[in-house]
């Protein structure tokens, strides 16, 4: 039986917690403060690598507004919330006959039938091919007539009944009825080059973060698509090896737009799913852009039902400061969608982009009429407005030196939101309610349930928000919890992680230090993990795990198990992490202090946090390196190439060199064009590869993947290139049909093992 | 310290010119919409007009007792707000404030200028 | 366009007095009702902001309720540099519109 509620507040406390933060800190080590006496084990390499301490997450998948699907011992399981009891679902014997291992699975809204995937195979970050049956849950059978095609792209049900909507060789397919035929929606697609209702290589990476490009009003009468254009787009091609026995390599062929090249075009339609006939195809009715953006280059980057009858689209053009949000209305007698221009809401940034990494979406009241969206206030925060459809102004509903992370549900009485406001920590979470008849009336429904444990939360509300899973990760052991909306009151405790954290108590275990320091009179914050045992009056080696992308946070309240655990545990190297210019959730001051000139302050940040942990005193300052993946790769690799004397060592994976390589909506959303006339002359002075005369004063590991479809081997090669031509010895290492995440179980432990033995070379480790 | 200065005012015939310039201090000033808001003698407020910040465009609205004579306008570049009056009317005749608008919770007029005062008569 | 109707037009009052002013608009505003104090000679000050939330720095005497089409401003307590003319304004639809101002007099 779980814990009950309140007998759980006291359990898990400073005493067993592995990691606490408060501010400036406060370090925890259980046992005895002398490092000699204690002879428990350390959290070691291996223990990372096949991950030895497991977290226990709690994934659960509302069906209603007061159930939800979870999984145990591979029996799905419906927990409900009414009544507090959990039933059988499905059985694992189920699909015993089935044949396949099943990947996933997706119950249709009115719970008659179960979608099973299989033979899934992967793309890239988000999008994959698989094969789908659908199991009929009335007859206990699976459906054999009219199956989904293998190979298929994206599966969708419609949000209520059990409409399928599908993509298959880059075409839209929806079936009425699980046993039907489908009824064919798009001719156009073909591979690399017309997309329907999928997105191509950049749109999943940087606008939708998603593979489907498909959206079912909330009735499921009517789909609306995107349809993207690459025929223009050049394409990156690289080797994928393969088997040993394959005599000529394979040749990748991508779409991918790199800074100032062609980009996809798109266009967007909407079918009604009602009206689909076996006689004739199908109408899919368009609705194009804006005026104001057919003027030139732009993106579709966001679309919301509003209700049965009403889209809200959003548009960015090209140049990433200027977005236009069109509400458009289904005109019965026309069977076309009306988007008044008095409609419109324009959205600009005249101190860098648009919203953190794009337009942030609408959050519609039930009527459609008014919206909620979090923008940018008069100081730089970005904070909640409200907006009437009618009416070009919005009203900002909350206020404050801190941000509005998201907007999590919205009621006829209540919006509830993430913040980071409680105790001012940029890198805390907490779960608020404010109320809609009087938005004075803000309430904190996380903030003092666990303070010390849980600081970082996210939520999962049911269908209506009736109930919610609060999902605490940290500082101490993750938490999950299930709440009534009606009075907030905690009902059960889910998952507490005890069993980990009892196996945990058996290992010097690292702290956490969660702090600021003041430059230019901002605060600009930073953690650290220490060593077991950390003594101030001693000297550490430090490791700089660096990111500083726009909008990133390295410095937060979360808990994690990873290798800088492990490096502070068994090697006592402090692991630290400082959120400097360009980073996010604390104001546009800071985060488009980098705006136009990637490669500058987030660098000289870096450089000068490291210069700043040096004088506190326990840091050998003969002894920090400096490690980063991706963009924290190329800060690495622009730090290292400073020329500072800070470093000694570091290690770039999967670097980005110089910033016309890589793709043009993410580089140019901060960078501009590189061209003359608007900002070529930033883009060649940023590069790794100007600095390379500077890396003969630094050891310096390289490592990429060779088959990276986001960061191209073609950047570590030229940084290669570059060492090479300036005489620099240098370590690299690459991974063999690896992509950027370099995360085969193979390769992801030779990376970790690599870099660890080049960190102990460089810190004189034994 | 947010200031705002309004400077301009005098008297004029009725159907002449003339135009308001409001100093502003002490903020970013094309962060914020402005408003002119007047206050004829011994009575009541009255919102004139007002331009939005730099993210929306400057755009303008106005009441329609001023809609088609008056024009809002902004220099950036100066921080400064101007309220150009054509056709003046002997209704006009009023104490012209500046005002920063806040949206938060609403528009409200966070901080005033001490006034300027404009006499239409012949 | 809304009206706005604030009474009484003026009254009369003792420091250490209780005062309440009345605003009621011609329709739903919604609680975007705002209360400015204005002294002779001298520019309107933000109090009250959203029917209740008081400007930074006005004191914690002043208090605003109401709702719908009917808003109330009172001072719990009046002091000597209270005695001014104070005016409501909705700020839910443009045209943004006043009352036509309560002064509130020394007895």
């Known amino acids: 039986m779980k814990t009950p509620w309140k007998v759980l507040l006291g359990l898990l406390g400073a005493a067993a917690l592995v990691t606490i933060i408060t501010v400036p800190v406060v370090l925890l080590n259980k046992g005895t403060d002398d490092a000699t006496a204690d002879s428990r084990k350390t959290y070691t390499l291996t223990d990372y690598l096949k991950n030895t301490y497991r977290l226990k997450l709690y994934s659960l998948r509302w069906i209603s507004d007061h159930e939800y699907l979870y999984k145990q011992e591979n029996n799905i399981l419906v927990f409900n919330a009414e009544y507090g009891n959990s039933s059988v679902f499905l059985e694992n014997s189920t699909f015993d006959e089935f044949g396949h291992s099943i990947n996933d699975y997706s119950i249709s809204p009115d719970g008659q039938f179960i979608l099973l995937e299989y033979n899934y195979v992967k793309q890239w970050r988000h999008s994959y091919t698989a094969s789908y049956d659908i199991y009929d849950l009335n007859k206990r059978q699976l459906i054999t007539e009219e199956r989904i095609p293998n190979n298929t792209q994206w599966v969708t049900w419609s949000p209520v009944g059990h409409k399928l909507a599908y993509v298959w060789n880059n075409d839209i397919y929806v079936k009425i009825e699980p046993n039907l035929p489908s009824y064919r929606i798009t001719w156009t697609g073909k591979e690399d080059i017309i997309y329907n209702g999928i997105t191509d290589w950049v749109y999943e990476e940087e606008v939708f973060s998603a593979y489907s490009a498909l959206w079912w009003s909330p009735n499921g009468t009517f789909l609306a698509y995107a349809q993207f254009n690459d025929t223009e787009v050049p394409l990156i091609e690289y080797s994928f090896y393969s088997d040993e026995s394959l005599q000529y390599p394979k040749t990748v062929r991508v779409p991918y737009p790199k800074a100032g090249a062609v980009n996809p075009t798109v266009k967007f339609f909407v079918v009604n799913t009602d009206s689909l006939s076996s006689v004739t195809n199908a109408t899919s009715i368009q609705i194009t852009a804006p005026a104001s953006m057919l003027i030139g280059d732009h993106y579709l980057c966001d679309v919301t039902w509003a209700t049965q009858e009403r889209i809200s689209l959003q548009w960015l053009r090209r140049i990433q400061n200027y977005s236009v949000m069109d509400i458009c209305d289904y005109d019965e007698s026309s069977g076309r969608w009306n988007c008044l221009v008095a409609r419109q809401h324009i959205e600009m940034s005249t101190t860098g982009w648009v919203g953190r990494f794009r337009p942030s979406e609408p959050h519609f009241t039930l009527d459609g009429n008014s919206f909620y969206k979090i923008i940018s206030n008069e100081e730089g925060y970005r904070h909640i407005c409200y907006f009437q459809i009618d009416k070009k102004d919005c009203t900002f509903i909350t206020k404050g030196t801190w941000e509005v992370i998201g907007i999590e549900a919205l009621t006829s009485d209540y919006l509830y939101y993430i913040s980071n406001e409680y105790k001012g920590m940029p890198g805390g979470r907490n779960l608020y309610k404010i109320q809609l008849s009087d938005y004075t009336k803000v309430t904190c429904l996380s903030c003092e349930l666990n303070p010390e444990r849980c600081q970082y939360y996210s939520v999962s509300f049911s269908k209506e928000a009736k109930y919610y899973q609060l999902r605490c990760s940290g500082p101490g052991l993750p938490l999950y919890t299930l709440h009534s909306s009606v009075n907030d009151k905690g009902l059960r405790v889910l998952e507490d992680n005890s069993a980990l954290d009892k196996m945990l108590q058996n290992v010097q275990m690292p702290s956490k230090k969660l702090d600021f320091i003041i430059l230019n009179e901002t605060k600009f914050w930073y953690q650290m993990i220490l060593p077991p045992h950390f003594d101030k009056s001693k000297k550490y080696p430090l490791l700089l795990d660096v990111y500083a992308g726009p909008c990133s946070q390295k410095a937060d309240t979360v808990f994690r198990l990873n290798w800088a655990t492990y490096l502070a545990s068994t090697e006592n190297i402090i692991v630290a992490s400082f959120d400097g210019r360009g980073s996010g959730y604390q104001g546009d001051k800071i985060m488009h202090a980098i705006n136009r000139r990637l490669g500058t302050f987030e660098v000289e940040d870096q450089i000068e946090a490291a210069r700043q942990f040096s004088k506190m005193g326990f840091v050998d300052n003969k002894r920090i390196a400096i490690w980063g993946w991706s963009y924290g790769g190329y800060v690495t690799s622009m730090v290292l190439g400073s020329g500072s004397g800070v470093f000694k060592c570091g290690i770039a994976v999967a670097p980005v060199s110089r910033w016309e390589y890589y793709d043009s909506v993410y580089t140019e959303r901060y960078m501009g064009l590189p061209t003359p006339e608007d900002n070529l002359d930033h883009y060649r002075n940023s590069t790794v590869m100007s600095r390379a005369e500077n890396f003969k004063q630094v050891e310096y590991l390289l490592i990429h993947g060779t088959a990276d479809d986001n960061v191209h081997f073609q950047q570590s090669a030229q940084i290669s290139k570059a060492l090479v031509d300036v005489g620099v010895d240098f370590q690299a290492m690459w991974y063999t049909d690896e992509d950027h995440g370099i995360a085969s179980s193979t390769a992801h432990q030779h990376i970790y093992t690599h870099m660890s033995h080049f960190i102990k070379q460089c810190f004189s480790l034994p | 310290e947010v200031q705002l200065v309004e400077s301009g005012g005098g008297l004029v015939q009725p159907g002449g010119s003339l135009r308001l310039s409001c100093a502003a201090s002490g903020f970013t000033f094309t962060n914020y919409y402005m408003s002119w808001v007047r206050q004829a003698p011994g009575k009541g407020l009255e919102w004139v007009a007002f331009i939005r910040d730099k993210a929306n465009g400057y755009t303008t609205e106005y009441s329609a007792s001023v809609k088609g004579r008056f024009t809002i306008s902004r220099d950036n570049s100066k921080n400064t707000l101007y309220l150009q009056m054509n056709s003046l009317r002997a209704e006009d005749t009023a104490v012209y404030y500046c005002?920063?608008?806040?949206?938060?919770?609403?528009?409200?007029?966070?901080?005033w200028g001490q006034g300027t005062l404009v006499t239409v008569s012949s | 366009d809304i009206q706005m109707t604030q009474s009484p037009s003026s009254l009369s009052a003792s420091p250490g007095d209780r005062v309440t002013i009345s605003c009621r608009a011609s329709?739903?505003?919604?609680?975007?009702l705002t209360w400015y104090q204005q002294k002779p000679g001298q520019a309107p000050k933000l109090l009250i902001y959203?029917?209740?939330r008081l400007h930074s720095g006005v004191p914690s005497r002043f208090s605003g309720s109401g709702s719908g089409t009917d808003y109330t401003l009172t001072i719990s307590s009046l002091e000597p540099e209270d005695f001014a003319t104070y005016y409501c304004?909705?700020?839910?639809?443009?045209?943004?519109?006043f009352g036509q101002g309560t002064k509130v007099e020394i007895k």
């Open positions: 959203y029917r209740s």
């Open positions: 329709q739903d505003i919604g609680n975007f």
């Open positions: 005002a920063r608008v806040l949206r938060y919770l609403g528009y409200n007029f966070d901080y």
């Open positions: 304004q909705q700020d839910n639809t443009l045209p943004w519109t």
